[in-house]
């Protein structure tokens, strides 16, 4: 491990922005420590407000965490060679607020990014794509880790949160190798409907710890390789017909739904017969009745038809205040 | 009170060289990116090159790049620009400048100047 | 490279009247989270100073007649009333990327 001190050359956000002549190939950025024998870089806590310029070559696992970037232009990680060997990208934590379309460009060989526990506030379409192309060239990005990346109410835009995030997962199909996604911890209230149709290779997608109180406009027909679903600590109340069918359709499918708020009356009755048969839920006798207040606490497992009723509709007429 | 204090300007012909300083008092000075911005006589302003607080990220324009070299050393308190192959246009009087950050950040504070002259 | 076009190049004000300066932007610098346009004042044979920092907010120790407003390409530094003092080069600069740029001033003289 060596670290190194400063040094004279630069690299653009752009590809015609401000450089200067190419970094040696081998040195370690000041405030960095550098492992050729690992290809590793790790420039963590330092307070750094931008991506180091003289990152070597060797460079395959880069740790930029818990720093203070706030915004990743385009190019931010162009370099002069191209840094080609960087594979696992780790942002977490550093305060970034804004992602901008094409921060990622011209890093060939990313497999792994991840970008938890920073705010974003402002996350580009073209974050992942790099164009604005209907169809741009696919990602090499295997792995997508977007955990907590949730703004404060005080700095969240008009549009949706969510919708932000899916354009960014959608533009241009350039995620169609992704294998795995995790967008836990997002206070995600729905999914947006197109989201899984543009990621037919996702092999794992942690859902956890949002908000979602529906899956019946998620489809996850084309997940044909799925093969771990996390949705637990949701608002989930009742999985109907349609999406109990798509999990039964997957064949490699392991499903996670603990610490929901299942509501145990007439609605639920399919899902209990489904849970009773499936292989595909893990730990389902863990699941419990959080409503009606008669039903609190009992097992999803143990409960019969007769258990599920609803309370008759009354006519208007027949209403009280 | 924050201080810039530029120094080391001068005469010098056409592809000589130069050494800037700026000496900062007043500020915990590395937790500061830096700037030199220059003003051609009669003209207006020119960002020249950045370096961040810890000497992890450099810099520079297109007009200088490959002949100008940014440093610093937060022990002495010290920005540096090393001027190689210097040319008539590089006439001007640079200034230091202190940001927090490059891209969120803003010039709050800047030294009086110091004044480049390059002509044979 | 982002070109800021400032007009007027001069304006000629009495003091105690308004004063106006735009700056405009070949490109955006704004996105949702932050706006990445400044102004400054550089009085005769003085350094710059700064007056506004992400387009509307004032630095420190700068009159309040001074004011800024603007997102996106088009952005305005306002004088509520002029003063003697304020006499100099406005310049505006962008953030948004290297290289920084500044515009290529307005000059406001008293009358």
């Known amino acids: 491990t060596s670290s190194a001190s400063s040094s004279s050359s630069s690299a653009p956000f752009l590809a015609s922005a401000a450089s200067a002549q190419p970094p040696l190939p081998d040195q370690c950025p000041a405030l960095c420590e550098c492992s050729e024998a690992a290809r590793t870089v790790k420039c963590v806590n330092r307070n750094l407000t931008e991506v180091p310029t003289d990152l070597p070559l060797y460079v395959r696992n880069l740790f930029l965490t818990g720093n203070q970037l706030a915004v990743l232009p385009a190019g931010a990680f162009a370099r002069r060679p191209p840094l080609a060997e960087l594979a696992a990208l780790n942002l977490s934590g550093s305060r970034l607020d804004e992602v901008r379309g094409g921060a990622f460009e011209h890093l060939p060989s990313l497999r792994q990014l991840d970008l938890s526990h920073n705010p974003l506030a402002y996350l580009s379409p073209f974050a992942f794509s790099g164009s604005n192309a209907s169809i741009s060239a696919p990602s090499p990005l295997v792995e997508l880790i977007l955990n907590h990346i949730v703004p404060p109410d005080d700095k969240r835009q008009n549009r949706s949160f969510e919708g932000m995030v899916a354009a960014a997962l959608v533009a241009g199909r350039a995620l169609q190798g992704l294998h795995l996604l995790e967008l836990a911890s997002n206070h995600f209230l729905y999914l947006p409907r197109d989201v899984l149709a543009q990621l037919p290779s996702l092999r794992y997608l942690d859902l956890s710890n949002n908000s979602l109180v529906s899956l019946t406009y998620v489809s996850f027909r084309n997940l044909t390789h799925l093969e771990s679903l996390h949705l637990e600590d949701n608002a989930l109340k009742v999985l109907h017909n349609g999406t109990l069918a798509e999990l039964q359709g997957l064949p490699h499918v392991r499903v996670f739904l603990d610490n929901n708020p299942w509501v145990c009356d007439c609605h639920m009755a399919d899902m209990v017969t489904w849970l009773k048969q499936t292989g595909v839920v893990q730990g389902k006798d863990r699941l419990t009745c959080a409503f009606p207040e008669k039903m609190r606490n009992r097992v999803l497992l143990e409960l019969n038809s007769a258990d599920l009723d609803c309370d008759p509709i009354l006519p208007p007429s027949l209403q009280t205040s | 009170e924050v201080q810039l204090v530029e120094s080391g300007g001068g005469l010098v012909q056409p592809g000589g060289s130069l050494r800037l300083s700026c000496a900062a008092s007043g500020f915990t000075f590395s937790n500061f990116g830096m700037h030199w911005v220059r003003q051609a006589p009669g003209k207006g302003l020119e960002w020249v090159s950045y370096?961040?607080?810890?000497?992890?990220?450099?810099y520079y324009a297109d007009t200088v790049k490959g002949r100008f070299t940014i440093s610093r050393d937060n022990a002495k308190n010290s920005l540096y620009l090393q001027m190689n192959s210097l040319r008539d246009e590089d006439t001007a009087v640079y200034y230091c400048a202190r940001t927090n950050s490059l891209l969120r950040g803003f010039f709050d504070a800047w030294g009086q100047g110091t004044t480049v002259t390059v002509s044979s | 490279d982002i070109v800021l076009t400032q007009t007027p190049l001069s304006l000629s004000v009495t003091p105690g009247q308004p004063a106006s300066i735009s700056c405009r932007a070949s490109q955006s610098v704004s996105s949702s989270s932050y706006t990445y346009l400044h102004w400054y004042l550089q009085k005769p044979g003085q350094p710059p100073q700064l007056l506004i920092k992400s387009a509307s907010n004032l630095e420190s120790g700068v009159p309040d007649r001074f004011s800024g407003s603007g997102s996106g390409t088009d952005f305005t530094l306002k004088i509520s009333r002029v003063e003697a003092e304020d006499v100099g080069v406005y310049y505006c600069?962008?953030?948004?990327?290297?290289?920084?740029?500044f515009g290529q001033g307005t000059k406001l003289e008293i009358k």
């Open positions: 600069q962008h953030s948004w990327e290297i290289p920084l740029t």
């Open positions: 370096i961040s607080s810890g000497s992890t990220s450099f």
